[in-house]
Every structure is written in C-alpha cells, then in structure tokens.
Interface confidence: medium
Amino acid sequence: SAPGEDEECGRVRDFVAKLANNTHQHVFDDLRGSVSLSWVGDSTGVILVLTTFHVPLVIMTFGQSKLYRSEDYGKNFKDITDLINNTFIRTEFGMAIGPENSGKVVLTAEVSGGSRGGRIFRSSDFAKNFVQTDLPFHPLTQMMYSPQNSDYLLALSTENGLWVSKNFGGKWEEIHKAVCLAKWGSDNTIFFTTYANGSCKADLGALELWRTSDLGKSFKTIGVKIYSFGLGGRFLFASVMADKDTTRRIHVSTDQGDTWSMAQLPSVGQEQFYSILAANDDMVFMHVDEPGDTGFGTIFTSDDRGIVYSKSLDRHLYTTTGGETDFTNVTSLRGVYITSVLSEDNSIQTMITFDQGGRWTHLRKPENSECDATAKNKNECSLHIHASYSISQKLNVPMAPLSEPNAVGIVIAHGSVGDAISVMVPDVYISDDGGYSWTKMLEGPHYYTILDSGGIIVAIEHSSRPINVIKFSTDEGQCWQTYTFTRDPIYFTGLASEPGARSMNISIWGFTESFLTSQWVSYTIDFKDILERNCEEKDYTIWLAHSTDPEDYEDGCILGYKEQFLRLRKSSVCQNGRDYVVTKQPSICLCSLEDFLCDFGYYRPENDSKCVEQPELKGHDLEFCLYGREEHLTTNGYRKIPGDKCQGGVNPVREVKDLKKKCTSNFLSPEKQNSKSN
C-alpha cells in the first residue's frame, strides 16, 4: 500500500479540533500583484510582508505597495504602510534584513526620474518604526550589511561608485569610483574590482582587485588582470588573465590578498567559467567548465590551502555561466552533497557523496518503488533527484531538495526511479539517514517544509486548481494526516515557515479570486497542540551517522571521526521545542589512506588508494606557484583531507621529494602590489 495508508499508521488524536483552534486567516486589503515576505530576526515572530501592484498606464507604469507587519509568526498582520509614508518600495531590491538579531531593516524606495539620489527607509527596532533617508546616489544594488557590524553598509551606485555608511545608512560616503563588484570580507574588510578604461564589461580581464580594511581611509591593490573574484570560507579567489593568451587561471589567497598562490586547476578560455559550488573554512568545491558548449564540467575538491585540487566528479551538469547546477549541500548530515551528471547519452543522473567529494555513487533505489521506463533492467535502477535544473526546465517540480541542520539525517526531494531523471510527473522521496536510503513519501509533486526540527513535516499538493487541504506527518513522513484549513479553496502560491525549521507555525499563502477582484490571503497554522508535550529523554534514541555495517569497528567513520546523535524516535509525538540543540557525540577514528589526498604532482590510479607520482611531471619543473615566490616545494605525496580528524592508523610516509618548480604567474606576487590612502 502507499505510504500513509498502512494499518499501523497511528492517528494523531482529535487533530482537526486542535488545528482548527490554531488556524488564523488574514485577508490582505490588496489587489493581487506580487508579494514578498521576510523574517526579521530569529525567534522574534516578526514578519514583514510587502505587496506591490503595478498599474500599466499609457505613458508610464504606476506602482503601489503596501507594507504589513506581524509579530506573532503570521497569525495577525497590521498595515504599517503609513510608517514609510505610503511610498512605493522597489521589489527588485527586496527587504534588506540585518544579520543575526540586529532588528535592522532597509527598504529602498522608488523615486521620480529627476531626483538627485535614491531614498531608503531604515528601521533598527524590528520594523516598529522607520526613518526616511535621502541618498546622495542612486543605488544599483541592495544595501549590503557587514557580517561583523550591522551599522556598516555598502552599496554600488548606478554610476559605479562604491558607497559606504558607518551609521546604518544615516550618512553615506563615496569611497571609490569605477567599481564593478564589491563584497564584504571578514573583519569589516571590503574587496572590490575597479576598471580603468571604459566600463566593467570592456575591462573584463583587465580589472584591478582592491582591498580596504578601514572602510575607505586607505586601500591596497591586491591583484591585476582580474576577470572576477569570489570569497568562500577563509579563501579569496581571483580569476586572472594569463600573460600570453586569453585563458585565465584561478589564484587563491588565505591572508586577505597579501599573498597569492596559483590553484592547481585547469585554465579556462573565454567561453568557459569557474564556479565555487561550496566552501567552508576547511576546503572548497570548485566547478571547472569544459571547453565548448557542453553544459558540463568537472568538480575539483581542494586541500586545506585551496591550492592543490583533486578531481572529484566528471561530467558535472552545469549549464552556461550563471546557469543551473543541481549541486546541493545536504545540511542535515556532515559530508553529504548531491548533484547531477550528464551522461554520454545526454541523460541526467543523480550522484551523491558521503565523504565531502571523495567518492560519488548513485542513490540507492527506494524499497517501496518500481523502476520506471528509463530503466533497462527493471530490477536495477537508482533514485534520481530533481533540483534547480529540472525547475529551470519547467518540469512539474515545485521545490528543490530540502534539508535542515537541526533535523538530523532528513532529506526531502522530488525524484524518479530509473536509469536517469525522467520527465514524467515526479513523486516526493524522503531519506532519514542523510541520503543512504530513501522511501517514497508522497505521490505526485508537493510543496514541503520541516517544522520543530523534524518533529513535523508539512506538505501541500502542487496543483493548478485551488486547494484547501494541508498534509502533515509526525513520524518523518511515514504516515500522513490531512487537514482542511478553509472551506473556500485558494489559489496556492507558497508555504512560509521561519528559517531554521524550529518553528511550529506554517503560513499558507495564496489568493482568492472572485468575479470582481482578487486578494492576497494567508492561513497560519500552529501545530503546538498536535505535539502536546515536551520531548523527554525516553523519546530519543542513539543513531550512528554514516552507519553501513553496525558491527564493523570503522562503521560511521567519515573524515576521520564518527558522530552519534540523539534522534527523536519516529513513534514519539512530542515537541523538540524552539531551544532544541542537536546532541551529537564525536569520536576519533584511526587513519586510513582514504583520509589523505594526493599532494601536488601525485595522483591516485583507479581502484588504488596509494598516491603515485604523475608520470608527465617526473623530472620536470612543475608549473606551480606557491605564494608567488621562487621556492622548492617539499612533499611526501600525501596531504590530510581538509577537516579530517583521524589519529594514528596509517601514516603514509615516503621519502620527501624536493619538487623544483618555476613560477609561471607571479603578477599577483607581493612586490607587484601597492597601497594608497585617501
């Protein structure tokens, strides 16, 4: 039988009455246009909703927006448009919400054509009050908060000026002209690229990379011949044009651009691109596009310096620059990533890694599913996950895969079971062990969200017809109950729950349509009475992550350590609560060769765990640039995988090689850099 229809499915008692008492409708006195929703702060219950409506007139477009505020997780809303003087807010800038619990909000207003600058509305008290501020420039981008100090803002102007405020947007100062891209780094540092000649586009590949660590008092040029730059974890990357031709290479710095090393990655031509797929303080996943319009490339994983890269996955699906990739970090289990590859026959297949890119495999076929028409062998096939690429191709996939750090092991995604992704209508699958095993959870496409750190999963069917039913599960998707939240169905537009999956409230957004008008409406359902009691110790069970063979002493060892979690029993219907903290217990593993990657000049032959010297580099000067200086590189052929905590075990010692090398690209070396002060 289908999931949720089994005899042993325990019903939640009297849930209709409990939910009916906790369902709150709000009809917005608004013509239907567009709506955007932002949460202000964490666990504050404050939501801002901005509705905008465009009336196309003959000569121009007339716009109207309204701002609403809730402080009870969306149960009630108050129209606060008067706090922003009934001004039309530009939706393309969204609502700039400050980091952490700063309570800061910046809204960017639409201004008339002749004005000398833009206008913003600022709040530092979770949108209770707003201050109007006229800007000395027209903003091109949304205001960006410094991650370290929410009073520090930066913005680019339509004239390519870099503007900074030190008092939360009250006063602004232009610190540099001719700026293409600017980003906050750590410690209130700003990195930005500048052009010298015509424009950002014209100077692409001839840009300069600058840094200021004092909000524009002084500057340092840290790179030239720059195509683009990016920040990931503790790494600063620059894509740099080669001296001789139109190719470019990645250079990396771990000291904010003071010193650079050439990344041991293939160079790319004009039509190709690099993309940082994921980065943390330990390592980086880098995609390098293949030459030609192939739609795929190669994933490389870095060492702890961001310099030496190991080939991780071939034929990785990634359409043109800024296009679509299915690369997904499964945040509910350490080391797990899912992505898609384009196979030789142009079919798309899903791959998963459990060890941070060390090995990729297909997803195991769900127990309760049959192989579809794409499968050559009806008994052997895999699960294939729909993500960004499927959504971009307008397949019937309403949502990307979902995982949450505090809902340990849970992954929810649309998928199909066969030899490749199918264009047929997908079903929804769930994994409760971080992607090792999967079960069909719901028939057909759905919107879904996780509440109470995994204690509740909520879903709504994806349909073109109006809906009035929501489904929920208290046992990680095994059994489902349905609840009719309104008599009058609505055209559903989205599910909204507080980021972090700790809340027990879900808001269902949509609009009603009558002969005369259409209006925005939201229904907020609080599940607190479904989970009547707080969870106790007996409600949790020990779970060893990455476990594949419970008797094996090395079971669960990933990146040199294993972790045991206290997880809620599926049969327990109780509240984890807003203060729930994931209880995990790490323990160190013995080292194996799999805990090491091959250092520069070495590689692993297929099906061998030993690193051997690359034959083409034997006896050659290596094109390797370490900190931009001529020096010898010593290596024993192995380097511990970033973030690996193993101890003892094998210690791959071999004689230390002295790899003599030449610097092929030293234009990012320290002596080429210069400083100036304002």
Partner: antibody
Framework: EVQLVESGGGLVQPGGSLRLSCAAS????????MSWVRQAPDKRLEWVAI????????YYSDTVKGRFTISRDNSKNSLYLQMNSLRAEDTAVYYC???????????WGQGTLVTVSS | DIQMTQSPSSVSASVGDRVTITCHAS??????IGWLQQKPGKAFKGLIY???NLKDGVPSRFSGSGSGADFTLTISSLQPEDFATYFC?????????FGQGTKVEKR
C-alpha cells in the same frame, strides 16, 4: 557465549621479547576492532594498542610505540601483541578487549601476567 | 593526552546505600565515556557506555550521567554483588585513558 582468552604471558628479562595471543569465540571476530589494555601492579589501567577490524590500521600509546606490534589473524579468530625491548615498567596483567563502533571496551578476557625482571 | 581524574579512590558502604563515583576529564569529551567493573579473579565487565547508556544485562540500579568533562556513576541501592572496583574510560581521542579506579568496599 562471547569469550576472549589471553595466553603467552610469563617472566622475561629486560630487553627480552614476548608474544601474547588472544583467542576469540562466540562472535564475528573480523568485524570488531580489538585492543590490548594492561593493568600495572598498582592497579592502574593503561590502554596499549588498538587494531581495526580488517587489520589495516593500528594505533599505539606513546609508552610502547616502536617496541610493541599489534596484529590479528581473522581466519584464526586471533589477536596478537608482539612485545620487544621489554622494560621493568611493562610488568602488568595484559587484557585483550573488544571494540564495536558503539562501545569501545565491551568484552574483556581474564588477562595474562607479564613480568619483566632480571 | 586526556587525563581522567576519578574520585574517591575508595568508598565504604553498606548494602542498600546509594554510591556515587565521579570522573573529571582534563578536556571536553562529549559523552565518550564508559564505566567498567572489576572483581578479583573475574574479567572486566562493561556497565555503561556513552556516559548514560546501560549495557544489556546490567541492572537498572546502575546509572551514568554527565556530559562534557564531568561524569558520574551512581549505584542507587548497593547490592552484595556490587562490591568491586570501578573504572571510567574515555574514548573520544587516542590514546584512550582510564581513571585511577574507585574501590567500593564493605563498611
């Protein structure tokens, strides 16, 4: 019944060698890590060495590193400790112990006494 | 190395008494601690793993608590067969280390 039986202990002179064995029965030996732990005359316990289930990986305490070698023969359900360059301070009762992924010292043998003395 | 400091070194108690033994780790070890029982002429017996989990077959009068660096073994009502020496062991990091032991003897 899960059982571990140590043997091979005895009196040996400083600088001498000894090989301890541990015979396992009642469980799938090849899926468990195994440790040697010793108890000195003052009753203090010291973990000596561990070997992974397949025998590929080993780890030693600093006090025995370079002198002792832990090994196993899964076909014989046996664990070994080769002790070289023995010192007076190595005198102890030596126990073998089983380690699962969940619990590191869940089954113990009765121990075998090693005395290093001239 | 992580030092495990166990106290007291010995305790005199009678049948029916509540006995508490503590172990302090020199650095945080999450819950990677086990408690062992040793009786003269018998093999060591594992009682508790992961700080709080009772090994199968161990009477429920034994319990463990604590997390981080401070841990406790409690015998809620001492029975005649519980007179023995008890050791804590940490297995968060190599080298694994043991407490000095606590001897529970008859008063």
């Amino acid at each position: 019944e899960v059982q571990l039986v140590e043997s091979g202990g005895g009196l040996v002179q400083p600088g001498g060698s000894l090989r301890l064995s541990c015979a396992a029965s009642g469980f799938t030996f090849s899926t468990y890590g195994m440790s040697w732990v010793r108890q000195a005359p003052d009753k203090r316990l010291e973990w000596v060495a561990i070997i992974s289930s397949g025998g590929s990986y080993t780890y030693y305490s600093d006090t025995v590193k370079g002198r002792f070698t832990i090994s196993r023969d899964n076909s014989k359900n046996s664990l070994y400790l080769q002790m070289n360059s023995l010192r007076a301070e190595d005198t102890a009762v030596y126990y073998c112990s089983r380690s699962s992924s969940h619990w590191y010292f869940d089954v113990w043998g009765q121990g075998t006494l090693v005395t290093v003395s001239s | 190395d992580i030092q495990m400091t166990q106290s007291p070194s010995s305790v005199s108690a009678s049948v029916g008494d509540r006995v508490t033994i503590t172990c302090h780790a020199s650095q945080g070890i999450s819950s990677n601690i086990g408690w062992l029982q040793q009786k003269p002429g018998k093999a060591f017996k594992g009682l508790i793993y992961h700080g709080t989990n009772l090994k199968d077959g161990v009477p429920s009068r034994f319990s463990g608590s604590g997390s981080g660096a401070d841990f406790t073994l409690t015998i809620s009502s001492l029975q005649p067969e519980d007179f023995a020496t008890y050791f804590c062991v940490q297995y968060a990091q190599f080298p694994y280390t043991f407490g000095q032991g606590t001897k529970v003897e008859k008063r």
